[in-house]
């Protein structure tokens, strides 16, 4: 038997993936555990093997289908269970009735690219990945730019309150190396959270023209 507190948190990427993390304050080092997903109104169910991510937490991804297929809707409720092997039996360690579109975390934006760069400004675009057509344009973005000598945590957040997959960064320093990241969040969902940050895009502003006042 396992004592201690347990936390079981899952997010839906809005298409065909539910990612789960299970934390348990009591050692279960050599036990095999899995997450089982059982939708209330679908003919399929799905299982994934929980793998350790730290001393007391495990994670896994429920792959529900092809990455861009709409496997769940706003009406679905999915019973999610953590099952751990005890001898020849499986024991239910945690359970939740999961409303996918109340618990969203989209995939990080992809395909970041510099559209145009000048001495003091840079236009950057990106794409969203595996996001449901349900959202229409009702998404928001946060972006940040890493300046020399600073950390990502120090970078001010720029908020885009609509589905705008580009940004024009202003007041940059000429001939300077920067990095840029963006993340996305739907407006829908009580427990929805920001996507992971995108992979950083490195870019360099153009040098100031010699002999010109910049």
């Amino acid at each position: 038997a396992v004592n201690g507190t347990s936390q079981f948190t899952c997010f839906y990427n809005s298409r065909a993936n539910i990612s789960c993390v299970w934390s348990q304050d009591g050692a279960l080092q050599d036990t095999s555990c899995q997450v089982h997903a059982w939708p209330d109104r679908r003919r399929w169910n799905q299982t994934c093997e929980l793998l350790p991510v730290s001393q007391a937490s495990w994670a896994c991804n429920l792959i529900l289908g092809a990455p861009d297929s709409q496997k769940l809707t706003t009406v679905d409720i999915v019973t999610l269970r953590v099952l751990c092997r005890e001898g020849v039996r499986w024991r239910v360690m945690a359970i939740q009735d999961f409303k996918p579109f109340e618990n969203l975390r989209l995939m990080a934006p992809i395909s970041l690219q510099v559209v145009h760069v000048e001495t003091h400004r840079c236009n950057i675009s990106w794409e969203i990945s595996q996001a449901s057509h349900y959202f229409e344009r009702h998404l928001e973005f946060e972006a940040r730019t890493l300046s020399p000598g600073h950390t990502w945590e120090e970078a001010p957040l720029l908020t885009l309150k609509q589905k705008q997959e580009w940004i024009c960064l202003e007041t940059l320093t000429p001939d300077t190396q920067y990095e840029f990241q963006v993340r996305v969040k739907p407006l829908q969902g009580e427990f929805t959270t920001w996507s992971p940050w995108s992979q950083p895009l490195a870019f360099r502003t153009k040098p100031a023209a010699l002999g010109k006042d910049t």
């Epitope: 297929s69 709409q70 809707t73 706003t74 009406v75 579109f101 109340e102 057509h133 349900y134 959202f135 229409e136 009702h138 407006l187 829908q188 009580e190």
Partner: antibody
Framework: EVQLVQSGAEVKKPGATVKISCKVS????????IHWVQQAPGKGLEWMGW????????EYAPGFQDRVTITADTSTDTAYMELSSLRSEDTAVYYC??????????WGQGTTVTVSS | EIVMTQSPATLSVSPGERATLSCRAS??????LHWYQQKPGQAPRLLII???QSISGIPARFSGSRSGTEFTLTISSLQSEDFAVYFC?????????FGQGTKLEIK
């Protein structure tokens, strides 16, 4: 410009079936949800159901699911709502609308259906 | 089924004044509440989503707020074109349901 243009007014006898069309333009019909909403006199708005053209799925409100069928023809960008076994209380304006599942962003002009013997 | 109750049924306000319309849900619906405006002979028009997010193209005088299961639509300074019927709609539980409407009329 997003547009949803519905077919004209209908007069039907009790027990008959009505089929209303909703021709859309200005957006990608194949990646959209089309909803249908009833507005009966003195009864307010009632959501009837939707069709998800990308997933090929329909959802119906429990109060309508025995009598309503929502379909779509993606070759003509047209959605249809068929209501059977009509009764006098089905006399109403019926709207098609585009939206995500949660709210209705753009609406058709409405189709009046009168059920009378 | 979640019941949405709007109050008052009719609200009489003078142009230029503030109007406050209320919508209460019979159970907790988080922020899954949306507001529509309907003028006579026209289809409803979406104004506000998720309790307080304005739709682009909607004048800034329209705003929404939430306190528990009670939602409020405020029109800060009424214009002649704002006199209409206003509906709320919940999308927390299936089937989605509308309030019965508040008629905003000229005082």
């Amino acid at each position: 410009e997003v547009q949803l243009v519905q077919s004209g007014a209908e007069v039907k006898k009790p027990g008959a079936t009505v089929k209303i069309s909703c021709k859309v333009s200005g957006f990608n019909f194949k990646e959209s949800l089309i909803h249908w909403v009833q507005q009966a006199p003195g009864k307010g708005l009632e959501w009837m159901g939707w069709i998800d053209n990308e997933a090929g799925e329909t959802e119906y409100a429990p109060g309508f699911q025995d009598r309503v069928t929502i379909t779509a023809d993606t070759s003509t960008d047209t959605a249809y709502m068929e209501l059977s076994s009509l009764r006098s209380e089905d006399t109403a304006v019926y709207y098609c609308a585009r939206g995500g599942p949660w709210f209705l962003s753009y609406w058709g002009q409405g189709t009046t259906v009168t059920v009378s013997s | 089924e979640i019941v949405m109750t709007q109050s008052p049924a009719t609200l009489s306000v003078s142009p230029g004044e503030r109007a406050t319309l209320s919508c209460r849900a019979s159970q907790i619906i988080s922020n899954n509440l949306h507001w529509y405006q309907q003028k006579p002979g026209q289809a409803p028009r979406l104004l506000i989503i998720y309790g307080l997010q304005s739709i682009s193209g909607i004048p800034a005088r329209f705003s929404g707020s939430r306190s528990g299961t009670e939602f409020t639509l405020t029109i800060s300074s009424l214009q002649s074109e704002d006199f209409a019927v206003y509906f709320c709609q919940q999308s927390n539980n299936f089937p989605y349901t509308f309030g019965q409407g508040t008629k905003l009329e000229i005082k």
